[in-house]
């Protein structure tokens, strides 16, 4: 029952940690502009990694997307690449785990296979979760780079009393989105592998065998029980699971054609 | 037709208080930034007040603020200026209007005549 | 609080000429997110509440004779008549629309000659 739980646990809050994954990398909120310097902006810049927006006080929103792919930086492009390798993976981790799940039943599927594809899609979703938070963090720390870098020549003065604010970008709500659905991601799979090793068949061989000592009508039963650990010599339906796994992060964005102020 | 209408205007005494309404129709408000312009006589127009279409960003002029408060209505698509502690220098043709592309306003009303005077 | 300064405050005129008047932002008004400049250009009559004739600095209204055109880019920007006609004399107003308070330049008077 415990099992049956935790699997169900694991695979709900890796849907979860999966459908924020998707919806971070579709936000157009990974960079918003910093309004330290000017908190009475008529005009908000935020940007995405699929397309840039400003959000005007009128309530008009114009985003426009990156119609190039050499001329993005690397950075945005491994960020991109992270979060696609999450989905994709976190997809197919979802994909395994449906059939892994013990209250579903198929056919006459082994409790074995399923422990296979519980620990697969663990593992999965592990790696998914390592490529979201992977990807958010070095975006984040793309943007606290810039941010330094554009407060060092803020004021780029064109003489005289003119003032030329250069726009800086901090932390927008998809990388927090991200960082907490790669967390979930990770944690649903790390509580699929723990489900793993619960699902794996415990086997139970009582072998009775009887000796019979010659004028003696006794009957000896020896130490006949064997608990399976999964560590011993038995292998009859029986798998020793080991894995690990790692993973790495992308990102997109959405559309929003009339944001509100 | 998208048309702005005006009212509530007239003749106060300096730390009195007028209640403008401006009507919108042909357009919803709730899905546009509205503002206030003043225009004194002879004088150019000054941008009075702002509300953001969801009404979360408010921005008044420093020489306003704290005494005048600008609000929406959405279900009567109107705006208002509330004016309190009235100065002669309130003086003006007071215009609603509407936020369009790039900040602009694109449609104002006739006005309504505000007169702070003892 | 950002300045319009406008210049000339009046310009007299013949009709068919062309004119050309300033407006000058203490602040840069382009915004680096979509590399437009949020200045507005108004056009008031007397008697009348200002009408709008260009935004964006260089984009006209819909509606708005194509003898206007609007120039310029972060601190200076320019208006022009390419042939002023009588219905073109008013008081010509550019705003900043890129931070409050959304402030008005004093305006450049036109008049017949």
């Known amino acids: 029952m415990a099992v049956t739980a935790c699997q169900g646990l694991g695979f709900v809050v890796s849907l979860i940690g999966i459908a924020g994954i998707i919806a971070a990398t579709c936000m157009d909120q990974w960079s918003t502009q910093d309004l330290y310097n000017n908190p009475v902006t008529a005009v908000f810049n935020y940007q995405g990694l699929w397309r840039s927006c400003v959000r005007e006080s009128s309530g008009f929103t114009e985003c426009r997307g990156y119609f190039t792919l050499l001329g993005l930086p690397a950075m945005l492009q491994a960020v991109r690449a992270l979060m696609i390798v999450g989905i994709v993976l976190g997809a197919i981790g979802l994909l395994v785990s449906i059939f892994a799940l013990k209250c579903i039943r198929i056919g006459s599927m082994e409790d074995s296979a399923k422990a296979n594809m519980t620990l697969t899609s663990g593992i999965m979703f592990i790696v998914s979760g390592l490529c979201a938070i992977a990807g958010v963090s070095v975006f984040a720390n793309m943007l606290v780079t810039n941010f330094w870098m554009s407060t060092a020549n803020m004021y780029t003065g064109m003489g005289g009393m003119v003032q030329t604010v250069q726009t800086r970008y901090t932390f927008g709500a998809a990388l927090f989105v991200g960082w907490v659905a790669g967390g979930l991601t990770l944690i649903g799979g790390v509580m699929m592998c723990i489900a793993c090793r619960g699902l794996a068949p415990e086997e139970t061989n009582y072998k009775a065998v009887s000796y019979h000592a010659s004028g003696h009508s006794v009957a000896y039963k020896p130490g006949g029980f064997k608990a399976s650990t999964g560590f011993g010599s038995n292998t009859k339906n029986k798998k020793i699971y080991d894995g690990g796994a790692r993973t790495e992060d992308e990102v997109q964005s959405y559309p929003s054609k009339h944001d509100y102020v | 037709e998208v048309k702005l209408v005006e009212s509530g205007g007239g003749l106060v005494k300096p730390g009195g208080s007028l209640k403008l309404s401006c009507a919108a129709s042909?357009?919803?408000?709730?899905?546009?930034?509205m503002a206030w312009v003043r225009q004194a006589p002879g004088k150019g127009p000054e941008w009075v007040a702002f509300?953001?279409?969801?009404?979360?960003?408010?921005h008044y002029v420093d020489t306003v603020t704290g005494r005048f408060t600008i609000s929406r209505e959405n279900a009567k698509n109107t705006l208002y200026l509330e004016m309190r502690s009235l100065r002669s220098e309130d003086t003006a043709m007071y215009y609603c209007?509407?936020?369009?592309?790039?900040?602009?306003?694109?449609?104002w009303g006739q006005g309504t005549s505000v007169t702070v005077s003892s | 609080d950002i300045v319009m300064t406008q210049s000339p405050s009046s310009l007299t005129v013949t009709t068919g000429e062309k004119v050309t008047m300033s407006c000058k932002s203490s602040q840069n008004l382009l915004n680096s997110g979509n590399q437009k400049n949020y200045l507005t250009w108004y056009q008031q009559k007397p008697g009348q509440p200002p009408k709008l004739l260009i935004y964006w600095a260089s984009t006209r209204e819909s509606g708005v004779p194509d003898r206007f055109t609007g120039s310029g880019s972060g601190t200076d920007f320019t208006l022009t008549i390419s042939s002023v006609q009588a219905e073109d004399l008013a008081v010509y107003y550019c705003q900043n629309d890129y931070s409050f308070p959304l402030t008005f330049g004093a305006g450049t008077k036109l008049e017949l000659k």
């Open positions: 042909g357009f919803t408000i709730s899905d546009y930034g």
């Open positions: 209007a509407r936020m369009y592309y790039g900040n602009a306003l694109d449609y």
């Open positions: 509300i953001s279409n969801l009404a979360y960003s408010i």
